[in-house]
């Protein structure tokens, strides 16, 4: 997929910022609000922000500009710059009236269905597990193979550098075609196939990508919130993987939840499968030592480990991936095309 241009976004924060710069009042208010950052630390949900009056005034002036309601896209150029603007403006929306964060990402529909030719897999043994088959599909695609090799290299070896590994993982899940990335990570394994389960759990190179000693989950979130990209991905995940009813149905489409989940890989909040024998996922952190924030910590942990929307989205995608390799499809490229159109 080509990277989305700003013009493809309904209201890109980069465009809105340029418009704002052309208006002296808006420009001054934006700069003032930006300088307020140091005096207003980003509050966690358990904290109340204390806001100087001049910052409130700057926020009030920005509320009438096109910056309010501006958005970014996960695959856009200058994404971090766009997100920086978004979170600066977000303060204007929420100052003095702290609201839950809203995802900065606008959904854009993929323009063309993605094809893959499953017939190329006949070089594999028929009884190969599906994680092996999806890995092979990635290898057979130049772009996927190149991106996967890049993170494989960065994340291997006894002295791997975690921050480099994470950056390459982020690049892979951002730039590889979505079905390749999802196939690689969300491949189904037979319940007793530990080898397959281990392959799946090792997809993100957890020995390098995840912290060697599990930090406190709230510390991890604090670290994440200090980075516009990580914060955006976490908020996007909590927006789209939030159950909306008694059965745990996702607030938006399951596909949107999965996209948000994969968007976290390579950030400080990188989740992973917890074992080789099931499809449970979790953050690599602990709530021990959370003191009076124990409840808040467990709720964050539970958003990953006990989330019916996410659990079912993963299960449904794995069922779909199983069907891809069943004999029911009339043509080897048909399956993915149908699924892509559906989303």
């Amino acid at each position: 997929d080509p990277l989305p241009t700003e013009s493809r976004l309904m209201n890109s924060c980069l465009q809105a910022r340029r418009k704002c710069q052309a208006d002296p009042t808006c420009s001054a208010a934006y700069h003032h609000l930006d300088s307020c950052t140091s005096s207003i630390s980003t509050p966690l949900p358990s904290e109340e922000p204390s806001v100087p009056a001049d910052c409130l005034e700057a926020a009030q002036q920005l509320r009438n500009s096109s910056l309010i309601g501006c958005m970014c896209h996960r695959r856009m150029k200058n994404q971090v710059a766009c997100l920086d603007i978004y979170w600066t403006v977000h303060r204007a929306r929420s100052l003095g009236n702290y609201e839950l964060d809203v995802s900065p990402y606008e959904d854009t529909v993929t323009s063309k269905p993605w094809k893959m030719n499953l017939s190329k897999l006949n070089m594999l043994k028929p009884d190969s597990d599906l994680c092996l088959k999806f890995a092979m599909l990635c290898t057979l695609n130049d772009k996927c193979d190149r991106l996967r090799k890049a993170y494989g290299e960065a994340c291997s070896g006894p002295h791997c550098q975690r921050h480099v590994c994470l950056r390459q993982l982020l690049t892979f899940f951002e730039k590889a075609a979505e079905p390749h990335a999802q196939g690689l990570l969300l491949c189904p394994c037979a319940p007793n196939d530990r080898g397959c389960g281990e392959r799946r759990r090792n997809t993100i190179a957890p020995n390098c990508a995840l912290p060697p000693v599990a930090p406190n989950c709230l510390e991890l979130r604090r670290l994440c919130f200090s980075d516009p990209l990580c914060r955006s991905r976490l908020v996007d995940f909590q927006t789209h993987c939030h159950p909306m009813d008694i059965l745990g149905t996702c607030a938006t489409e399951q596909s949107r939840c999965l996209r948000a989940y994969l968007g976290l890989i390579g950030t400080a909040m990188t989740p992973n499968f917890v074992s080789n024998v099931n499809t449970s996922v979790a953050l690599s952190c602990t709530c021990r030592g959370s003191g009076n924030l124990q409840e808040e910590c467990e709720m964050l942990e539970g958003f990953f480990s006990h989330n019916p929307c996410l659990t079912e989205a993963i299960a449904a995608k794995m069922r779909f991936h199983s069907q891809l390799f069943s004999q029911d499809w009339p043509h080897p490229t048909f399956a993915v095309m149908a699924h892509q159109n559906e989303n």
Partner: antibody
């Protein structure tokens, strides 16, 4: 410490009404779905009703639909069960429950329970 | 509605015995099953959540397993305080449903 305390149980005649309350403390009340479960004397547990954290979604067992109403006051950290047109078969200990913080997204999880309040419907 | 069939409905055992209680769902409930213990005149207490996870503060002699339709609660080395009633509950489908209970009695 997380606590749930039910009250309002009493002896009432068939056809009568009663309002049960469950006062919560020790947690962020509005983040959790709350559930009422009952247990007739010498019998098993039966789910009665659940309300979402915001109070916008409510769910009922067929046996009480149209007669019972669940509601909550998030400013007072309290959940209510208004019981109308009571029948002898509604006689039970009524418990209120909630999920743990870890499972707050599973509305039907019942990790924490109150001590219960007895409702007796008899003439 | 999903039927939860718990068996046996009662059992007798000695202190120190290992006992197993089973719960069968009328359809697949994944691992969305909890186990409760109830002492006479008291509220139920959660022992195991999501089929196999021990609630904090629950002794490690309690264990849960299973997925899909068949689930097991195991109590290793029964203690005097364990001779009470146990219930399973599914929360995969609405309405949530409980098993009929298993009363564990002392021999």
């Amino acid at each position: 410490e997380v606590q749930l305390l039910e009250s309002g149980g009493n002896l009432v005649q068939p056809g009568g009404s009663l309002r049960l309350s469950c006062a919560a403390s020790g947690f962020t009340f509005s983040s959790y779905a709350m559930t009422w479960v009952r247990q007739a004397p010498g019998k098993g547990l039966e789910w009665v009703s659940t309300i979402s954290g915001s109070g916008t979604s409510t769910y009922y067992a067929d046996s009480v639909k149209g007669r019972f109403t669940i509601s909550r006051d998030n400013s007072r950290d309290t959940v209510f069960l208004q019981m109308n047109s009571l029948r002898a078969e509604d006689t039970a200990v009524y418990y209120c429950s909630k999920p743990s913080a870890l499972r707050f997204l599973h509305w039907l999880a019942m990790d924490v329970w109150g001590q219960g309040t007895l409702v007796t419907v008899s003439s | 509605d999903i039927q939860m069939t718990q068996s046996p409905s009662s059992l007798s055992a000695f202190v120190g015995d290992r006992v197993t209680i089973t719960c069968r769902a009328s359809q697949d409930i994944r691992n969305y099953l909890d186990w409760f213990q109830q002492k006479p005149g008291k509220a139920p207490k959660s022992l195991i959540y999501a089929a196999s996870n021990l609630q904090s503060g629950v002794p490690s002699r309690f264990g849960g397993s299973g997925s899909g339709t068949d689930f097991t609660l195991t109590i290793n080395s029964l203690q005097p305080e364990d001779f009470v009633t146990y219930y399973c509950q599914q929360y995969n489908s609405y309405p949530p449903t409980f098993g009929g209970g298993t009363k564990v009695e002392i021999k």
